[in-house]
Amino acid sequence: EICGPGIDIRNDYQQLKRLENCTVIEGYLHILLISKAEDYRSYRFPKLTVITEYLLLFRVAGLESLGDLFPNLTVIRGWKLFYNYALVIFEMTNLKDIGLYNLRNITRGAIRIEKNADLCYLSTVDWSLILDAVSNNYIVGNKPPKECGDLCPGTMEEKPMCEKTTINNEYNYRCWTTNRCQKMCPSTCGKRACTENNECCHPECLGSCSAPDNDTACVACRHYYYAGVCVPACPPNTYRFEGWRCVDRDFCANILSAESSDSEGFVIHDGECMQECPSGFIRNGSQSMYCIPCEGPCPKVCEEEKKTKTIDSVTSAQMLQGCTIFKGNLLINIRRGNNIASELENFMGLIEVVTGYVKIRHSHALVSLSFLKNLRLILGEEQLEGNYSFYVLDNQNLQQLWDWDHRNLTIKAGKMYFAFNPKLCVSEIYRMEEVTGTKGRQSKGDINTRNNGERASCESDVLHFTSTTTSKNRIIITWHRYRPPDYRDLISFTVYYKEAPFKNVTEYDGQDACGSNSWNMVDVDLPPNKDVEPGILLHGLKPWTQYAVYVKAVTLTMVENDHIRGAKSEILYIRTNASVPSIPLDVLSASNSSSQLIVKWNPPSLPNGNLSYYIVRWQRQPQDGYLYRHNYCSKDKIPIRKYADGTIDIEEVTENPKTEVCGGEKGPCCACPKTEAEKQAEKEEAEYRKVFENFLHNSIFVPRPE
């Protein structure tokens, strides 16, 4: 029987009974948070052979081996992973061995076995026989191998029963427990699975089979399962489902969901039965089971029960993620926040249509409304008292509405109202009237010319750049000296610059009034000599990188006809020169014959220009004499036995330091101090562990039902 869609067994070990008749778990299996040590010997699930997603074990007291629970678990497909892992064994306090002696294949994903204080038989398993790549496996903080004394079956009697393979240059027997070898198929089978009697399975089988060369006798399928047969692709009129089986249209239509999109059922797209159309596609009609490509971003209608959605934090904005049409009214009231502009753009940037009104008030954290970067239509179906559909009141730092050169916004019905926005120039409001088609709708008091823009440089002159010079990590720029009517009003200049891969940045990108700003800022004093043009050397830049730069004059708030004069430049795009690339990454060399070396590498992380070719140099090395000096028959002193507590940052210390050849003399040597690179790697490793642990806790801890 197929069980699913993922099974979560927690708190009570008796819930394991849910696995009784399962042959395939379509989804994940979680066994976790069972704090009372129980006797699991009476629980055995020999029917379970396949888990299509991942297996997660976390804090299950009393469980010593998985072999008795899942004696026939053969394949973990990893169709969906837990933080890149298909098998996670974490903080299993009593687990002594994994024991999954029939586990033959983890199709996708790596394994993470961490902080299991009593867990042995880890170095005796050759994971490369089970996984395609072992480089991402993370096996850390378990019982030290030297304390385990792992012995494979028959080793003590000097009649070893298991086969040997090489791991990390160590040729050894491979087993899961003291009495279970790790199964290996004859080399004649190649990548194919084999029976218990070492006969090769059908190429479409995965893991194992009950009869050789028979696609109906597979324990699991390499590709897809359909009507008792393993097939390379789903037959006509059937569709891939959950990455492992083929289902017909009727089956797909009859899947019931309890997730947010359940009202429309599953869809068939690109030969697959799936919960929703993939990114960039939309249903071809509300009752359709088929998807068609969207023109532009896919429409997503969001509705607010109470008609008006208040955006007063990032959390409230989060509810609008992906929405393109908002049915209702938007009330924006952002008084403070961290990195607010980019967060709002992330969650509200796709909104194109608001059916009601938009009201922005007391939003002192906002400098611009450009976070609503796709808003093109305010219908004004519902309006504020006084027939306003766009209302902007008391926003102390609002300087820009939108970049009107690249913005088309229509307000279909209703008027606009602006008051007490001291940094918002009236010219900006008048420009909005023209663009939105509301010119003539507003009465005299709707746009207050006295208290909008009273603290801004609304009459701006243009500063012109006069020269630019670049090197690999520097830019020198100069600009015309700005001369306001009264030269004493000019205080200094501020240069703004940032990396800009594309020529599409605006002054207000990522900027809010709470200190977040995607631009770097440098103050430039006036040159004492009136004939010298002001300029700056920007240094510490990246080679072969395009930067956007603009300059603003810092002036006294000098009022002339109720307006403050200021000056700023257009945005200039300028690229630094190319430089030497960083070193190529992951250089690997291997010999495939007595006269050839194959060398592979990845491109440098910092090309610093357009790479045109690589230079490969090699030279013959003399044999290392040290190899002959060491006595390989001598065993190092066995360290003092120490119980592993599941922590990681413990260095094993023996009573006497090892005596090695050191500095030309024999004598005790201290370990070399760690290099900066090693320290950095350790720091990153610790950080990565924390990130995983947080992910684990956030994923599995849920509030207790009320």
């Epitope: 849910r18 899947i255 019931l256 969901s257 309890a258 997730e259 359940d262 509030p703 039902p705």
Partner: nanobody, 123 residues
Framework: EVQLVESGGGLVQPGGSLRLSCAAS????????MSWFRQAPGKEREFVSA????????RYADSVKGRFTISRDNSKNTLYLQMNSLRAEDTAVYYC????????????????WGQGTLVTVSS
């Protein structure tokens, strides 16, 4: 602890009607697909009907199509089965079952089960 408690069973004449209820104690009732199964004496448990989390979609076994209606009230954490035109072969213990996230037509191993309520159709 998730609990499902069925009620509404009893003796009814052929052609009659009954309404079964299933009261669920779970934090987010709407995130479970709910189903009715039944088991007649000496027979295997069989699927009767299921309903999606929001209640907008449902499916039925061929033997009950047109006669039975499944519904749910998420505000009351309750599942219902309205049974009309009852026949003698509908006699069985009716079980309410819940599965998180989704249920395919071939899932019979639901996560949570009630104790059952007996429906007897006899003249």
């Amino acid at each position: 602890e998730v609990q499902l408690v069925e009620s509404g069973g009893g003796l009814v004449q052929p052609g009659g009607s009954l309404r079964l209820s299933c009261a669920a104690s779970m934090p987010t009732f709407s995130s479970f697909v709910m189903s009715w199964f039944r088991q007649a004496p000496g027979k295997e448990r069989e699927f009767v009907s299921a309903i999606s989390g929001s209640g907008s979609r449902s499916r039925y076994a061929d033997s009950v199509k047109g006669r039975f209606t499944i519904s749910r009230d998420n505000s009351k954490n309750t599942l219902y089965l309205q049974m009309n035109s009852l026949r003698a072969e509908d006699t069985a213990v009716y079980y309410c079952a819940a599965n998180p996230r989704r249920a395919t037509p071939d899932y019979t191993q639901y996560a949570y089960w009630g104790q059952g309520t007996l429906v007897t159709v006899s003249s």
